[in-house]
């Protein structure tokens, strides 16, 4: 018996088609993805093949103005339209708190939303009961398939799930649910979840009875053969893991941003064992037409976005200096504003010993593309911010050793004076450079804001200590020559859309007046 699994993950509000790098579509003839194009391909496969499941492995939320404006209603609406069969909760589904998950998505979705390792307690338990499930048994043709969900247990550090949701260890939580499915005579079981490729592989290895793992969170691209676009495969598709009980378990992920549709064909025997598995992600490029009815619906929903872009978010009473003449040479107040917003967006009081889990921000000056003039009645709009941060990136959480940070700051000024983009703007960091010294030895003082303290203060950076840092995904991926960050990072979790982080902060503060205050000397 053959099952076709179609899967997406980490779509991050890319409802409209995008350019090849998943930013805003400029030249439509070269654009990719989007729900209208996805629907065309899904329908084509549904018509051609008998047993098809369409699954999403989480993080539909967060990433473009679509989420900022519609707050998840767009996810429910278009996933319903595409007739998804199931979705796992990702960490970003909690970005607007539990209410921001329950009302727009959980209550509106016509498909099961799953996570076995999230347990509700207190008053939330009855409120959320039945709105998400640990597993769901789906009829497919004359067979049944069990789908069991999981979510990164790091979610409390990455999003805003509140205090009434407990995130358990994935493997510990999944095993009893899989065992329950087995007692219900469900012998074909897919683990669908959002904890990253390493955890996906562990689940395949450790959870007895899981036949296939469909994952997300790490934006992993797998491919067998010659890849069709710019993404470099992390392994073959599917990636085969030998389980502790001697089975070959296929593990898949489909990159991110709706650029690909994962396509996996699984052959099961009478006992539910995987006899064979093969497939590849399908690149959703312009050779696949956008479905006209979904496209018309997108255009209808788009109107509200255009109106939103020109509305006032808040005011500035100072000039926000985002000029390259400032931000690529010295501390600039636009850099300070953005870094302050980045830290503010990551306030998570999860431990009494820590005032916050992260205190540091770095930001490449070259990523700041425009100033904002205060002489327009001080008004700041989304449109203004889109000029400052036009690349549609995210502000991510990484863990780095002190020694890596030191290398990063040396790189920041290794060719100082040439107006290059790698000059770092900071938050929660005091750095002193001596530019008379030779490149690679110019950082003379590097103090960082403590986290394990009740009164934050600056202490010297320790080379062997592990620090959490918020930075643009561009830097986490080694951009602007920061290869040491990419090569040496110990953990990387993708964060919220850059413009959204700054706009939320400005809306919260109402009036802003960032200063140049001696963070960089």
């Amino acid at each position: 018996w053959e099952l076709t699994i179609l899967h997406t993950n980490d779509v991050h509000s890319r409802l409209e088609q995008t350019s090849e790098d998943s930013s805003k579509c400029v030249n439509a003839s070269r654009c990719m993805g989007g729900v209208a194009r996805l629907f065309t391909k899904v329908q084509q496969i549904r018509r051609a093949e008998p047993n098809v499941l369409l699954l999403d492995a989480g993080d539909q939320y967060q990433g473009t103005i679509w989420f900022t404006v519609y707050k998840g209603a767009e996810v429910a609406h278009f996933m319903n339209a595409l007739r998804y069969d199931a979705m796992a909760l990702g960490n970003h589904e909690f970005d607007n708190g539990v209410e921001g998950l329950i009302e727009p998505l959980l209550k509106e979705a016509k498909f099961p939303i799953l996570s076995a390792n999230i347990k509700a307690k207190g008053p939330l338990a009855s409120q959320i009961s039945g709105l998400y499930l640990p597993y769901k048994v789906l009829p497919v043709g004359d067979e049944v398939v069990g789908i069991v969900g999981y979510t990164s247990k790091e979610t409390p550090f990455l999003s805003n799930p509140g205090t009434n949701l407990v995130f358990e260890d994935e493997i510990t939580a999944l095993q009893p649910e899989v065992d329950k499915l087995k007692t219900l005579n469900v012998n074909k079981i897919i683990a669908l979840g959002h904890s990253g490729f390493e955890m996906d592989k562990l689940i395949a290895q450790k959870v007895r009875g899981v036949d296939v793992v469909v994952g997300g969170h790490s934006n992993t691209f797998l491919y067998t053969g010659n890849p069709p676009s710019k993404e470099v495969p992390a392994g073959k598709y599917p990636f085969i893991v030998t389980s502790d009980d001697g089975r070959k378990v296929p593990v898949v992920q489909a990159y991110a941003f709706g650029k690909y549709l994962g396509y996996l064909k699984i052959e099961f025997d009478e006992r539910g064992n995987v006899i064979s598995s093969h497939g590849n992600p399908i690149l959703l490029n312009s050779s696949i037409p956008e479905d006209p009815s979904i496209k018309a619906d997108i255009n209808k929903w788009r109107i509200k976005l255009d109106n939103y872009s020109t509305q006032e978010l808040g005011k500035t009473i100072v000039y926000l200096d985002g000029s390259s003449q400032s931000c690529r040479f010295r501390e600039c107040n636009m850099g300070n504003l953005i870094c302050d917003a980045m830290i503010n967006n990551n306030l998570r009081h999860t431990d009494e010993m820590f005032w916050n889990h992260v205190s540091m921000c770095i930001l490449n000056g070259g990523g700041i593309r425009s100033p904002i003039d205060e002489r327009n009645n001080g008004t700041i709009t989304w449109e203004n911010l889109a000029a400052v941060l036009p690349f549609g990136g995210t502000f991510d959480l990484v863990q780095l050793k002190g020694s890596t940070l030191k290398k990063a700051f040396e790189h920041s000024v290794h060719r100082y004076g040439q107006s290059t983009g790698e000059f770092l703007q900071v938050g929660g960091i005091h750095v002193v450079y001596d530019l008379s010294r030779k490149p690679g030895d110019r950082v003379v003082k590097l103090d960082v804001l403590c986290t394990k303290c009740r009164v934050p203060s600056y202490d010297p950076l320790k080379m062997d200590e592990v620090y959490k840092v918020i930075l643009p995904n561009f830097l986490a991926n080694g951009g602007d020559g920061f290869q040491m960050i990419k090569d040496e990072l110990l953990r990387h979790d993708s964060g919220d859309q850059d413009i959204n982080v700054v706009s939320t902060y400005i809306s919260k503060m109402k009036v802003i007046y960032p200063a140049v205050e001696g963070r960089i000397k």
Epitope: G141, D142, E143, T242, D269, E270, R271, N273, I275, S276
Partner: antibody, heavy 113, light 106 residues
Framework: EVTLKESGPVLVKPTETLTLTCTVS????????IQWVRQPPGKLLEWLGV???????DYNAAFISRLTISKDTSKSQVVLTMTNMDPVDTATYYC???????WGQGTLVTVSS | DIQMTQSPSSLSASVGDRVTITCRAS??????LNWLQQKPGKAIKRLIY???SLDSGVPKRFSGSGSGTEYTLTISSLQPEDFATYYC????????FGGGTKVEIK
């Protein structure tokens, strides 16, 4: 639990027709095929034929003229019919799942006058 | 038709021995190979499917490997209950079996 059970006569006269039934539980014949295999005493396993989930059948070329496999999906039963039986057809007859994950106990059929 | 050549046809071994049985296909069967165990008076039991995956409840001393046309069943440490006849079965085309290997007590 996934099980298969063969049933039918233990003794068949030469030139007669053998009819064996394989009763399936734990899975659906609309999703999986059933294979038939035999093993003469002290000899090797020999594939006879298969009926697929869609209802079509394939046969070992050596038996194509006298073998028919059919099924009744609603009853979860597959029937093997072999005409013109000969003493050399004396064997244990097995039905098995399409992928060989499950086998019946086998039924010994003796062809003798 | 795909032919399967299994060797040896029989072997004598002691408890604790490592035993290896091989099957050669007349053409590439793309990992579509099972290993079966047959004991007198008992139902045939599949031990390994898709070349190397272990069936539920089968001890980990059994392992399968191979690709293309060459396949191997290994019993890492023979136990008293392992004395039986073993068959390879290809299902890339119409089923064909190897000639069997009878594992006897030395």
């Amino acid at each position: 639990e996934v099980t298969l059970k063969e049933s039918g006569p233990v003794l068949v006269k030469p030139t007669e027709t053998l009819t064996l039934t394989c009763t399936v539980s734990g899975f659906s014949l609309s999703s999986y095929g059933i294979q038939w295999v035999r093993q003469p005493p002290g000899k090797l396993l020999e594939w006879l034929g298969v009926i697929w989930s869609g209802g079509s059948a394939d046969y070992n070329a050596a038996f194509i003229s006298r073998l028919t496999i059919s099924k009744d999906t609603s009853k979860s039963q597959v029937v093997l019919t072999m005409t013109n039986m000969d003493p050399v057809d004396t064997a244990t007859y097995y039905c098995a799942g399409q992928y060989g994950s499950v086998w019946g106990q086998g039924t010994l059929v003796t062809v003798s006058s | 038709d795909i032919q399967m050549t299994q060797s040896p046809s029989s072997l004598s071994a002691s408890v604790g021995d490592r035993v290896t049985i091989t099957c050669r296909a007349s053409q590439d069967i793309g990992d579509r190979l099972n290993w079966l165990q047959q004991k007198p008076g008992k139902a045939i039991k599949r031990l390994i499917y898709a070349t190397s995956s272990l069936d539920s409840g089968v001890p980990k001393r059994f392992s399968g490997s191979g690709s293309g046309t060459e396949y191997t069943l290994t019993i890492s440490s023979l136990q008293p209950e392992d004395f039986a006849t073993y068959y390879c079965l290809q299902y890339a085309g119409s089923w064909t079996f190897g000639g069997g290997t009878k594992v006897e007590i030395k």
